[in-house]
């Protein structure tokens, strides 16, 4: 049994780190493999993560952790029974992938404006809470040529779009993702998308 692509891990800077890797051939990850992790810290214990399959040769493991601080460093050992397949380390604060924003809602009852709101995925006491900026992707299934990214660089998880900039009488979808500039994170996954129908019509005198 051999590791083809070494484990690569990212932290949500809250309570979970996710490690993914590829094996040299088809593997029943949960039955054959264990990923052991231990914080380099006084009197810490070794904890075990049972991986899941992620495609034929891929494995993924969700490591349960405490809140992340910059000093944290983990040793990682990938075992197949009594055989050590790979040994490495992981510093969560240096490999952050934020959680995806949630509760994306479209409000169309505001005159002349489409208001999109979503929730910050972190509690206020988390360091990422006040560091997230967002990208909102809006597209139309009726108009495949239309797809826009709106960068939200302020803290408030809202975006206002003049309804007049969207075509009337067709449906749109929106999704949002996040990143934290000061933590040099990757982008989060996209939130689930939300669909709405743009019924806005320009006033008669502006036509």
């Amino acid at each position: 049994m051999k590791v083809l692509q070494e484990p690569a891990c990212v932290s949500d800077y809250m309570s979970i780190s996710t490690c993914e890797w590829k094996m040299g051939g088809p593997t029943n990850c949960s039955a054959e493999l264990r990923l052991l992790y231990q914080l380099v810290f006084q009197s810490s214990e070794t904890h075990t993560c049972v991986p899941e399959n992620n495609g034929g040769v891929g494995c993924v493991c969700h490591l349960l952790m405490d809140d992340v601080v910059s000093m944290d460093n983990y040793t990682l050992d990938l075992w197949a029974g009594q055989q050590l397949l790979w040994k490495g380390s992981f510093k969560p604060s240096e490999h952050v992938k934020p959680r995806a924003p949630g509760n994306l809602t479209v409000h169309t009852n505001v005159s002349d404006t489409v208001l999109l709101t979503w929730s910050n995925p972190y509690p206020p006491d988390n360091y990422l809470y006040n560091d997230l900026t967002y990208a909102v992707n809006i597209w139309s299934e009726n108009d495949p040529a239309y797809s826009r990214i709106h960068n939200v660089t302020y803290l408030k998880p809202t975006l206002r779009i003049p309804a007049s900039t969207l075509k009337s009488g067709i449906s749109y979808r929106a999704r949002v993702r996040a990143w934290a500039q000061h933590y040099n994170t990757t982008w989060s996954e996209w939130s689930p998308s939300t669909k709405w129908y743009n019924s806005y019509r320009e006033p008669f005198e502006q036509r």
Partner: antibody, heavy 125, light 112 residues
């Protein structure tokens, strides 16, 4: 009531051996790291050894490394310190103390919040 | 090893007056914000040490509020707002960031 009771001290000749015990009660013993601290007559406190809750990680002062062995039996809620090749400078009162909660991924520290009454070890010919 | 240096080594105090003991470490004991791995212990004559303050400024259960800990990084202070006769004994700071745990030399607090 959370309590630690040491035993096993006594008079031993240089080169001899002693085994100290520390019985814990009133808390979930296996969840906590444990520590031994000693105090030579008229001197300050000196850390000797620590062990994680499961016993998988052990730590020693340079002055006792290779001679002392810390261990625990969680089924008996008991901590041990096996002392071999004793020297005159090992003469001290030995205290066991409850250390950090080590079952969490990052052990939670509340200080050495419970100490035993101490057991006296005298090494002399 | 981390060296812990206490001062003063002897502290005569009048009852009701404040007292302050300093402890300096040879390297930072700050692991993360608010978590300085330094403790303060009191050992009364003929007794086992007892925990007063942990993680730099957290008062242990049952410790009177006249005891307080402060400081961060390498400089720490134990303050007693109004010394009482029962506070006499040796006070030790200890770093618990990593083994070997190390203690200060001890400060003998006595009543004038």
């Amino acid at each position: 009531e959370v309590q630690l009771v040491e035993s096993g001290g006594g008079l031993e000749q240089p080169g001899g051996s002693l085994r100290l015990s520390c019985a814990g009660s009133g808390f979930t013993f296996r969840d906590f790291a444990m520590t031994w601290v000693r105090q030579a007559p008229g001197k300050g406190l000196e850390w000797v050894s620590s062990i994680s809750g499961s016993g998988s990680s052990t730590y020693y002062a340079d002055s006792v490394k290779g001679r002392f062995t810390i261990s625990r039996d969680n089924s008996k809620n008991t901590l041990y310190l096996q002392m071999n090749s004793l020297r005159a400078e090992d003469t001290a009162v030995y205290y066991c103390a409850k250390d950090r909660l080590s079952i969490t991924v990052r052990p939670r520290y509340y200080g050495l919040d419970v100490w035993g009454q101490g057991t006296t070890v005298t090494v002399s010919s | 090893d981390i060296v812990m240096t206490q001062s003063p080594l002897s502290l005569p105090v009048t009852p009701g007056e404040p007292a302050s003991i300093s402890c300096r470490s040879s390297q930072s004991l700050l692991y993360s914000i608010g978590y300085n791995y330094v403790d303060w212990y009191l050992q009364k004559s003929g007794q086992s040490p007892q925990l007063l303050i942990y993680l730099g400024n957290k008062r242990a259960s049952g410790v009177p509020d006249r005891f307080s800990g402060s400081g961060s990084g390498t400089d720490f202070t134990l303050k007693i707002s109004r010394v009482e006769a029962e506070d006499v004994g040796f006070y030790y700071c200890m770093q618990a960031l990593t083994t070997p745990y190390t203690f200060g030399q001890g400060t003998k607090l006595e009543i004038k």
